[in-house]
Structure formats: structure tokens, C-alpha cells
């Protein structure tokens, strides 16, 4: 017996109520591939979600987050509250980055400043809660008569604290 369902295009479903005849997906549902036996319910972008792309008979709706939130997870499955630069989101809300750490985005965690000395360099611009340090030339490069050739970077030693 031929599988008549394989003839049903995207946007339809193979209607077992009537001998595998193709029927259009009902409103607010979709089938993104041919040969489907059911249509999937369209995603609804409610609450902290807003619609980026409307659902059609062949593709699901796509959501974004409303202002003050950002997407997390595949296909924006969650919305997480934004914080200010220089902050990170904790269970108790947005908290300033601890000294020696920074966050230059509205999302994510505070990260340690770069340890310039690990690369044999010196701190050119100090770090803040919002910005990483800027590393400059090594102290040796700044001394009079120093060779223009860059010396090899010293081996990394554990335990160096941020500059």
C-alpha cells in the first residue's frame, strides 16, 4: 500500500480521519516538513517574550525578549533580566562586580581582569567594574637602550594576582 501521507506538503497534515487525505493545518499550528501526521501548536510569545517572527502554516513563531531582558537557550527558550555593565545577575538580583573583576555587557558574569604580568607586560590602563585592564609593553621594553626585539614571554606561574 502506498503511503499517501508522503504526498502531504509542509503546512498540511495527513488526515487519518479521512483516508490519509492532506488537510491544511488549523490556525495557530504548523508543519514545517511534508508527510506530517499532525500539526504542531505555534509557540506563543507572551509575558517577557515578544514576537520576532509570526507563526505561519509552515514555520513556528520566533520570540525575542522584551526590553530589559535578553535571550538564553536554544531558540530563545528563556528570558533573563539585564543588568548594567559592571554588574552580574545573582539569585538576589543584579550585584556590582567584585574588585578585580569586570563585565562589559548587560548579561553574563563578572570575569577577572587580565593578568598582564603573565604575558610579561605591564598595566597600561587600570581595570574597572565595566572594563578590563589594558596591558602595555613589558617594563623591560620601557627601559633606555632596550632591544627592539621582543623577549620571549616568561613561563606562566600559578598564583599571580590581578594587577
Amino acid at each position: 500500500l502506498q503511503d499517501l501521507c508522503s504526498n502531504c506538503p509542509a503546512g498540511t497534515f495527513c488526515d487519518n480521519n479521512r483516508s490519509q487525505i492532506c488537510s491544511p493545518c488549523p490556525p495557530n499550528s504548523f508543519s514545517s516538513a511534508g508527510g506530517q501526521r499532525t500539526c504542531d501548536i505555534c509557540r506563543q510569545c507572551k509575558g517577557v517574550f515578544k514576537t520576532r517572527k509570526e507563526c505561519s502554516s509552515t514555520s513556528n513563531a520566533e520570540c525575542d525578549c522584551i526590553s530589559g531582558y535578553h535571550c538564553l537557550g536554544a531558540e530563545c527558550s528563556m528570558c533573563e533580566q539585564d543588568c548594567k555593565q559592571g554588574q552580574e545577575l545573582t539569585k538576589k538580583g543584579c550585584k556590582d562586580c567584585c574588585f578585580g573583576t569586570f563585565n562589559d555587557q548587560k548579561r553574563g558574569i563578572c570575569r577577572p581582569w587580565t593578568n598582564c604580568s603573565l604575558d610579561g607586560k605591564s598595566v597600561l590602563v587600570n581595570g574597572t567594574k565595566e572594563r578590563d585592564v589594558v596591558c602595555g609593553p613589558s617594563p623591560a621594553d620601557l627601559s633606555p637602550g632596550a632591544s627592539s626585539a621582543t623577549p620571549p614571554a616568561p613561563a606562566r606561574e600559578p598564583g599571580h594576582s590581578p594587577q
Epitope: 490556525p27 495557530n28 502554516s57
Partner: antibody, heavy 123, light 108 residues
Framework: QVQLQESGPGLVKPSETLSLTCTVS????????WSWIRQPPGKGLEWIGR???????NYNPSLKSRVTMSVDTSKNQFSLKLSSVTAADTAVYYC?????????????????WGQGTTVTVSS | EIVMTQSPATLSLTPGERATLSCRAS???????LSWFQQIPGQAPRLLIY???TRATGIPARFSGSGSGTDFTLTISSLQPEDFAVYYC?????????FGQGTKVEIK
């Protein structure tokens, strides 16, 4: 609300191809099947076939060898071509929205029809 | 294909009378996919009943449908002058969709 309007030549010569277009207004052609039905003078209704917005078709076996349907979603139109016509193809030709389900899977029949266009096959 | 047979071919009645139209399918049809249409001369068919018994939008309550399996009935409880027309049953349970040959309701 959705409205349908058939258009095309009212007179076609025998052995030639009948071509009709149905224009959908007041709604989108997308997400539905669309049917063609004809009615010879003084006779009953005959279903010719249907087309989905992707171009997928089902034809009445009695006409299948002569029928071609197509769809132009950009113009909100679908079309019927019937080749090698004879006097027996003289009829009023109607386009209609084919049956569909609502969100609760209640099924609706052919609920919207065009007013019909008369096609006469004669030399 | 499913053959739909309507009876009688013609029904001669006076306004105010009850009209009972029959439709028989050559094989069982799920009632969800049985429709009735009204056609006034010179006009396109109009959907009256879908799902064998549900009135379409704007259809007066004097029209009712019933039946299941192979036997279906359209009833007009009290004929109005505008009801004299041809009535067709139609199935879209199995391809190809098919119509009955029609019942003409005429003024006696």
C-alpha cells in the same frame, strides 16, 4: 471577509485550452486548499480538483489527463487550465475555498465561492 | 469514488410547508465531511450545512441537517419564498469530492 473572483475568456474553441484565474481578496491565499468546480448548463456540480498554496494538487480522475492547476501566492491567485476542450466542457466554472479545520479541529466545508464565470466551447 | 444520490429529484411544496430532502452515499461517510448547499438560479452555490448538522454563518434556524454513515437529511421546517431553489449534498471524506445530482424545491 474572503471573496473570490473568477476571470478568463468566455469563449474557447474546440481542441484549445481553457484558462481561468481565481483572485482571492480580503484574506490571504496561504494555508488553504482551493478548489475548482463546474456546472454544465441545466446540470449538477462537478468537482474538478484542488490546489494547496505550495502547489500540491489533487484532480478528479475523470479530468486528470487534461487538468493543470497552479498558484501564484504573490498575486493571491490560483489558476485552472483544461486542455483539448470539447462542447461537453461548456459550463459555469466556480472557484471555492476548500474545506478546513479551525483551532478546535471542527471541519468547515467549501464555505466561500466565487460568483462563477461562463465558458462556452464553440468554433 | 463515493457516489452521492439525492431524492427526490423534485419536491413540489407550498410556502410554510416542511421540506425533507434525502442524500445517500454509496459508502459510509464520516458526518464531519458532509455538506449541504443551496443554489438559487443564476447564483453560485451557498454553504448551508457543514458537518452534516451545523448551520453555516447567517443561515436561518429553519434549516437543519441530520444523519450519519450513508444516510443524510436536510430539513426546511417552514418553507419561505426565498427557499425555492436547488439543494446539493456533497462529501469531502474521500477524493474525489463528489456532489449529489441535486433536489429542486419548487412552488406547488
Amino acid at each position: 471577509q474572503v471573496q473570490l473572483q473568477e476571470s478568463g475568456p468566455g469563449l474557447v474553441k474546440p481542441s484549445e485550452t481553457l484558462s481561468l484565474t481565481c483572485t482571492v481578496s480580503g484574506g490571504s491565499i496561504s494555508s488553504y486548499y482551493w478548489s475548482w468546480i463546474r456546472q454544465p448548463p441545466g446540470k449538477g456540480l462537478e468537482w474538478i480538483g484542488r490546489i494547496y498554496t505550495s502547489g500540491s494538487t489533487n484532480y478528479n480522475p475523470s479530468l486528470k489527463s487534461r487538468v493543470t492547476m497552479s498558484v501564484d501566492t504573490s498575486k493571491n491567485q490560483f489558476s485552472l487550465k483544461l486542455s483539448s476542450v470539447t462542447a461537453a466542457d461548456t459550463a459555469v466554472y466556480y472557484c471555492a475555498r476548500d474545506g478546513w479545520y479551525d483551532e478546535d479541529y471542527n471541519y468547515y466545508g467549501m464555505d466561500v465561492w466565487g460568483q462563477g464565470t461562463t465558458v462556452t466551447v464553440s468554433s | 469514488e463515493i457516489v452521492m444520490t439525492q431524492s427526490p429529484a423534485t419536491l413540489s411544496l407550498t410556502p410554510g410547508e416542511r421540506a425533507t430532502l434525502s442524500c445517500r452515499a454509496s459508502q459510509s461517510v464520516s458526518s464531519n465531511y458532509l455538506s449541504w448547499f443551496q443554489q438559487i438560479p443564476g447564483q453560485a452555490p451557498r454553504l448551508l450545512i457543514y458537518g452534516a448538522s451545523t448551520r453555516a454563518t447567517g443561515i436561518p434556524a429553519r434549516f437543519s441537517g441530520s444523519g450519519s454513515g450513508t444516510d443524510f437529511t436536510l430539513t426546511i421546517s417552514s418553507l419561505q419564498p426565498e427557499d425555492f431553489a436547488v439543494y446539493y449534498c456533497q462529501q469531502d471524506y474521500d477524493l474525489p469530492w463528489t456532489f449529489g445530482q441535486g433536489t429542486k424545491v419548487e412552488i406547488k
